[in-house]
């Protein structure tokens, strides 16, 4: 015999679900135990069966899930999955916030990514902070040169996609450049998109040659010579 335990706790890491009104929300608490446990749901500490909810709810016990379609502000609250068997019980809380704000294009924090100067061989981090009502996706782009030109015949720049990521709202997205070389110098763009549209901001990376230790040591004296 075994008390209930979470089988996929990594799928339960997102505790706060902030979703726009009208969206579908799914909470999962995949569990196991011996005997096979049962699952029930509470809303704000009270047994929750969705009778008073327009559209009701879908309970899929074999998937350990609760699904609510077309959420409205009155669905806000703390949802608790309670998993029990004869040996013991476990519970987990999810917080649901229903957003009524007008969803907008992603907003990128001014000044990020920032123009950066680095020395050959060093590591560089470019930051991009995104504010978005809808879950944003991010791309990091590097502007490149093809056949000596930065732009195609259509007038649009040539770019290379370095990284693509889905992030949570208001998270900082980082592009790591390790052991930079002169070829890494150039323009980098953080692109953030959501269901409304895309937003871009760019920065320049300047890469300096490796410092000569002899030259560096002599440099202060040179300033004072006649």
């Amino acid at each position: 015999q075994q008390a209930p335990y979470w089988t996929h706790p990594q799928r339960m890491e997102k505790k706060l679900h902030a979703v726009p009104a009208g969206n579908t929300v799914k909470f999962r608490c995949p569990a196991a135990g011996n005997p096979t446990p049962t699952i029930r749901w509470l809303k704000d500490g009270q047994a929750f069966h969705g009778e008073n909810r327009i559209g009701g709810i879908r309970l899929r016990h074999q998937h350990w899930s609760l699904v609510m379609e077309s959420v409205v502000p009155s669905d806000r609250g703390t949802y608790t999955c309670l998993v029990e068997n004869a040996v013991g019980s476990i519970r987990y809380n999810y917080l649901l916030d229903v957003l009524e704000r007008s969803p907008h294009r992603p907003i990128l924090q001014a000044g990020l990514p920032a123009n950066t100067t680095a020395v050959v061989g060093s590591d560089v981090e470019l930051l991009c902070k995104v504010y978005s009502d809808a879950q944003p996706h991010i791309q990091w782009l590097k502007h490149i040169v093809i056949n000596g030109s930065s732009f195609g015949a259509d007038g649009f720049p040539y770019v290379q996609v370095l990284k693509t990521a889905d992030i949570n709202s208001s998270e900082v997205e980082v592009l790591y450049l390790r052991n930079v070389s002169a070829e890494d110098a150039g323009e980098y763009t953080c692109l953030a998109g959501n269901s409304i549209g895309l937003s871009y901001q760019s920065a320049w990376l300047t890469v300096l040659p490796e410092e000569d230790p002899t030259w560096t040591a002599a440099a202060p004296e040179a300033r004072y010579t006649d």
């Epitope: 979703v19 726009p20 009208g22 969206n23 579908t24 007008s102 969803p103 907008h104 294009r105 907003i107 990128l108 001014a110 809808a134 879950q135 996706h137 791309q139 782009l141 259509d154 649009f156 770019v159 996609v161 693509t164 763009t189 692109l191 998109g193 959501n194 269901s195 409304i196 549209g197 895309l198 937003s199 871009y200 901001q201």
Partner: antibody, heavy 124, light 112 residues
């Protein structure tokens, strides 16, 4: 050729339901948000709803919230609009419109490709 | 919601002459990325709208250079430098910065 083709329109009584479809071709449908826009006879354009590329985010105009549901099947390259509790004021041509892509775009980030539209008439 | 107000309601233009349509938004359409998200469309009889101008002043591919967009923040203008017979239709401005996306009421352009 990039194309959007709407279907499913027709004449329906008030209070009844209808489901519109929009078949996409010529581009990677699963990488784009998609919108519905409508136009009442002799009137201007009204945005109805949007769905994100993966279906995880949906937004609606207040005039249809709670009655209409936007959805998509990326395996079939098809966008849907389920319209319930239809009213006379829902009478319009319904256009399917391509929205923003998932990544870098040359040119506008959406609202560049429109279907020909499908007519919905709500009348008793 | 952002309200888009278009003027005039209709316009009758002699071929070869210029035409100008104005659009005002109730809020700034200048975004944090420096772009202004106003789009212009023309809708010809029995057809869906066709994109002319995006992000304030960029001509969409295939659009003749007699069409131009300008303005800033809340006041926008679509200009046709020399109107041609094929330019007949209803012109709409649209804000593409937040949902609900909203359109101007339309300006009907006719040929004298």
């Amino acid at each position: 050729e990039v194309q959007l083709v709407e279907s499913g329109g027709g004449v329906v009584q008030p209070g009844r339901s209808l489901r519109l479809s929009c078949a996409a071709s010529g581009f990677t449908f699963s990488s784009y948000a998609m919108h519905w826009v409508r136009q009442a006879p002799g009137k201007g354009l009204e945005w109805v709803a949007v769905i994100s590329y993966d279906g995880s985010n949906k937004y609606y105009a207040d005039s249809v919230k709670g009655r209409f549901t936007i959805s998509r099947d990326n395996s079939k390259n098809t966008l849907y609009l389920q319209m319930n509790s239809l009213r006379a004021e829902d009478t319009a041509i319904y256009y399917c419109v391509r929205g923003a892509g998932r990544g870098y775009t040359y040119g506008p980030d959406g609202f560049d490709i429109w279907g020909q539209g499908t007519m919905v008439t709500v009348s008793s | 919601d952002i309200v888009m107000t278009q003027t005039p309601l209709s316009l009758s233009v002699t071929p070869g002459q210029p035409a100008s349509i104005s659009c005002t938004s109730s809020r700034s359409l200048l975004h944090s990325d420096g772009k202004t998200y106003v789009y212009w469309y023309v809708q010809k009889s029995g057809q869906p709208p066709q994109l002319l101008i995006y992000e304030l002043s960029n001509r969409f591919s295939g659009v003749p250079d007699r069409f131009s967009g300008s303005g800033s923040r809340t006041d926008f203008t679509l200009k046709i430098s020399r109107v041609e017979a094929e330019d007949v239709g209803v012109y709409y401005c649209m804000q593409y910065i937040e949902a609900p996306l909203t359109f101007g009421g339309g300006t009907k352009v006719e040929i004298k």
